[in-house]
């Protein structure tokens, strides 16, 4: 398929509440009307899908209701937020962008964003 350049930050640190946000930007070679954005997680050479959303250019990104991802789009830029992360979810998160319509189909893969998640220390018991 036709390749497309996708850029994303190298490293992101999740908040203490387990939320990580990053921007995924793609160089659209044409005037796409329908775009699909997928977040993949690569760990131990295994690649799994974290979430995916298809949107019409100019409209909002809509992930499934039970998705851990949310996002907004602006031009060729997608702002992605992943929630509910724990230390065990630390890993490389890859942004995949597909230009679905009109043909031809284009696909771009970012180099990945290493998301570090640190579980918060439990609050110490207090004697009151």
């Amino acid at each position: 398929c036709k390749a497309m350049h996708v850029a994303q930050p190298a490293v992101v640190l999740a908040s203490s509440r387990g939320i990580a946000s990053f921007v995924c930007e793609y160089a659209s070679p044409g005037k796409a009307t329908e775009v699909r954005v997928t977040v993949l997680r690569q760990a131990d050479s295994q690649v799994t899908e974290v979430c995916a959303a298809t949107y019409m250019m100019g409209n909002e990104l809509t992930f499934l209701d039970d998705s851990i991802c949310t996002g907004t789009s602006s031009g060729n830029q997608v702002n992605l937020t992943i929630q509910g992360l724990r230390a065990m979810d630390t890993g490389l998160y890859i942004c995949k962008v597909e230009l679905m319509y009109p043909p031809p189909y284009y696909l771009g893969i970012g180099n990945g964003t290493q998301i570090y998640v640190i579980d918060p220390e439990p609050c110490p018991d207090s004697d009151f």
């Epitope: 398929c1 699909r36 696909l107 893969i109």
Partner: antibody
Framework: QVQLVESGGGVVQPGRSLRLSCAAS????????MHWVRQAPGKGLEWVAV????????YYADSVRGRFTISRDNSKNTLYLQMNSLRAEDTAVYYC?????????????????WGRGTLVTVSS | DIQMTQSPSSLSASVGDRVTITCRAS??????LAWYQQKPGKVPKLLIY???TLQSGVPSRFSGSGSGTDFTLTISSLQPEDVATYYC??????????FGGGTKVEIK
């Protein structure tokens, strides 16, 4: 064994409809993109349509767009082609064909497994 | 759309001969080309993808070469079971997927 078996072909009058099915077995159907390719009698191969492994995307040849609909039921390991407003020029053997799909690189866009085909004849 | 032109449309050769079929794209397609074999009354079978990579189980007498616009399928030593029609297919800019018109190979 690994195979694709088409069914549903037959003789139909111009303007009428027909639905083709393709039953897959011996492999994980839900991991593959699927295509329909046709071959008119004595002629070459013509790509008709494709559907993504999960049904999330579909494309059609200009010659059938708006008349044909490709769909799949992964729970039944079956691919379908709904053909409406059939024309004489749609007469052909219709093959379903498998297309590898990689989560990182997408469809491969070539066909590593073909069914035996089903003949559709559009004639009054 | 990119057009694929195969030549010759048919050929006749003797058993043991080296047979060459060419496929030309109207625009550059890098190495995004596949070759199929269709024996009389049978289903097409993938021979080669990525212009030169042999599909598993395909005899080594088949080979593919080329990049850009000009591609070649070669049968180094023609066998009786190679009687078939051979099709090229481009897949660099999909859809649509486009096949060549086919080359019919017969034995003299």
């Amino acid at each position: 064994q690994v195979q694709l078996v088409e069914s549903g072909g037959g003789v139909v009058q111009p303007g009428r409809s027909l639905r083709l099915s393709c039953a897959a077995s011996g492999f994980t159907f839900s991991s593959y993109g699927m295509h329909w390719v046709r071959q008119a009698p004595g002629k070459g191969l013509e790509w008709v349509a494709v559907i993504w492994y999960d049904g999330s995307n579909k494309y059609y040849a200009d010659s059938v767009r708006g008349r044909f609909t490709i769909s799949r039921d992964n729970s039944k390991n079956t691919l379908y082609l709904q053909m409406n407003s059939l024309r004489a020029e749609d007469t052909a053997v219709y093959y379903c064909a498998r297309d590898r799909y990689d989560i990182l690189t997408g469809p491969y866009w070539y066909f590593d497994l073909w069914g035996r085909g089903t003949l559709v004849t559009v004639s009054s | 759309d990119i057009q694929m032109t195969q030549s010759p449309s048919s050929l006749s050769a003797s058993v043991g001969d080296r047979v060459t079929i060419t496929c030309r794209a109207s625009q550059g397609i890098s190495n995004y080309l596949a070759w199929y074999q269709q024996k009389p009354g049978k289903v097409p079978k993938l021979l080669i993808y990525a212009a030169s990579t042999l599909q598993s189980g395909v005899p080594s007498r088949f080979s593919g070469s080329g990049s850009g616009t000009d591609f070649t399928l070669t049968i180094s030593s023609l066998q009786p079971e190679d009687v078939a029609t051979y099709y090229c297919q481009k897949y660099n800019s999909a859809p649509p997927l486009t096949f060549g018109g086919g080359t019919k190979v017969e034995i003299k």
